[in-house]
Interface confidence: low
């Protein structure tokens, strides 16, 4: 089915990174435009992105109302200036997306270190807790709202001086470690979740060494 | 490759009770409605039961009552627990797999992953 | 319930011919409508969903098409695997019901 001047949409994928959700496809439409629908697996379908030239949907907005639901869009090819005409069946056409679960396939951003402060030979390091934009009672939660336990940070440290890196694990958004007095170290993190199959990790975060202002130093 | 393998068929009295098990791999199992279809010897297909990724289950008039469907998402399994079991309910019970969407302009992609079959024989 | 009539009951027929089979619904089922293959001693097989839409792995000789109430599998040239019966399935009301089958021999 389908009219006879539209071309079906085709590599339909879903980019998303802290569930910030967009579904991109292709082609660049040539006299036609596009409409997108999106539906968990036992609701109705929700139409957005209404009569666009675009090759992307945000989605984000419906995604977020329940980030464990699997996700299945749709896009719709019709005739530019003409949304009513379709084909001989009396639909448009259409390509169905791949499913997408957001919780256990959004990207994880890159992580921030937020701040280290050194206490003698300890050094407390402190991962930012990027907010994202999934809300509960009209507030934004952060990352670790939404993952809880699920989501760990691994942090990779070593002193200036040399490239042997060491590591630590965390469940919250802070570490507790060692360090040889009168050292400089440099720190990176990365957040995890080990439960997942795919998508388990995200980048590296910038390289933090101490001496620079993130950091602070206390003399005990 | 994504594949359901079916156990706990066999023979049992009438009103006796008998539990069916599938086993699902290759895909990520919580993501997916799953069925039980019957099919009597020399007959067609029968739907059986239902239960969607959220745990609604949904059953066929002539066992309703009488057989429960349940999965464990943790074991990747599906179940069908069948009670008095009558001669009527003697078939080929398969297991089935789907991406279920209701709803307006709703679709869904149909039953694409099948068990192997168990047989449940009725008999005194 | 819905109910699904299938015709002919039985269609014989030689390869590489046309085989034309109908699934008839008692009310309209929209486009929510499945056609399935089943061999001896198998499990079912997924041909067609969404009434026109084929499987993966199915060959572009499976057609599907209609839609509301009358819907029709269309094999362009019968292959020796083809023998065998199918089904059609709708689901747009519980409870979820098949057709009797359409057995495809070989003539």
């Known amino acids: 089915s389908g009219t006879t001047n539209t071309v079906a949409a085709y590599n339909l994928t879903w980019k998303s990174t802290n569930f910030k959700t967009i579904l991109e496809w292709e082609p660049k439409p040539v006299n036609q435009v596009y409409t997108v629908q999106i539906s968990t697996k036992s609701g109705d379908w929700k139409s957005k992105c209404f009569y666009t030239t675009d090759t992307e949907c945000d989605l984000t907005d419906e995604i977020v109302k329940d980030v464990k639901q699997t996700y299945l869009a749709r896009v719709f090819s019709y005739p530019a200036g003409n949304v009513e005409s379709t084909g001989s069946a009396g639909e448009p056409l259409y390509e169905n997306s791949p499913e997408f679960t957001p919780y256990l396939e959004t990207n994880l951003g890159q992580p921030t270190i937020q701040s280290f402060e050194q206490v003698g030979t300890k050094v407390n390091v402190t991962v930012e807790d990027e907010r994202t934009l999934v809300r509960r009672n009209n507030t934004f939660l952060s990352l670790r709202d939404v993952f809880g336990k699920d989501l760990i940070y691994t942090l990779y440290y070593w002193k200036s001086s040399s490239s042997g890196k060491k590591t630590a694990k965390t469940n919250t958004n802070e570490f507790l470690i060692d360090v040889d007095k009168g050292e400089n170290y440099c720190f990176s993190v990365q957040a995890v979740i080990p439960s997942r199959t795919v998508n388990r990790k995200s980048t590296d975060s910038p390289v933090e060494c101490m001496g620079q202002e993130k950091g602070e130093f206390r003399e005990i | 490759e994504d594949q359901l393998v079916q156990s706990g068929g066999g023979l049992v009295h009438p009103e006796g009770s008998l539990r069916l098990s599938c086993a699902g791999s290759g895909f990520t199992f919580s993501n997916y409605a799953m069925n039980w279809v019957r099919q009597a010897p020399g007959k067609g297909l029968e739907w059986v039961s239902t239960?969607?990724?959220?745990?609604?289950?949904y059953y066929a008039d002539s066992v309703k009552g009488r057989f429960t469907i349940s999965r464990d998402n943790a074991k990747n399994s599906l179940y069908l627990q069948m009670n008095s079991l009558r001669a009527e309910d003697m078939a080929v019970y398969y297991c089935?797999?789907?991406?279920?969407?209701?709803?307006?302009?709703?679709?869904?992609?149909?039953?694409?992953?099948w068990g192997q079959g168990t047989t449940v024989t009725v008999s005194s | 319930e819905i109910v699904l009539t299938q015709s002919p009951a039985t269609l014989s027929l030689s390869p590489g011919e046309r085989a034309t089979l109908s699934c008839r619904a008692s009310q309209s089922v929209s486009n929510y409508l499945a056609w399935y293959q089943q061999k001896p001693g198998q499990a079912p097989r997924l041909l067609i969903f969404d009434a026109s839409n084929r499987a993966t792995g199915i060959p572009a000789r499976v057609r599907g098409s209609g839609s509301g109430t009358d819907f029709t599998l269309t094999i362009s040239s019968l292959e020796p695997e083809d023998f065998a019966v199918y089904y059609c399935?709708?689901?747009?009301?519980?409870?979820?019901?098949f057709g009797p089958g359409t057995k495809v021999d070989i003539k």
């Open positions: 239960v969607d990724t959220g745990g609604s289950t």
């Open positions: 089935a797999r789907d991406l279920l969407v209701r709803g307006a302009l709703g679709y869904y992609y149909g039953m694409d992953v």
């Open positions: 399935q709708q689901r747009s009301n519980w409870p979820f019901t």
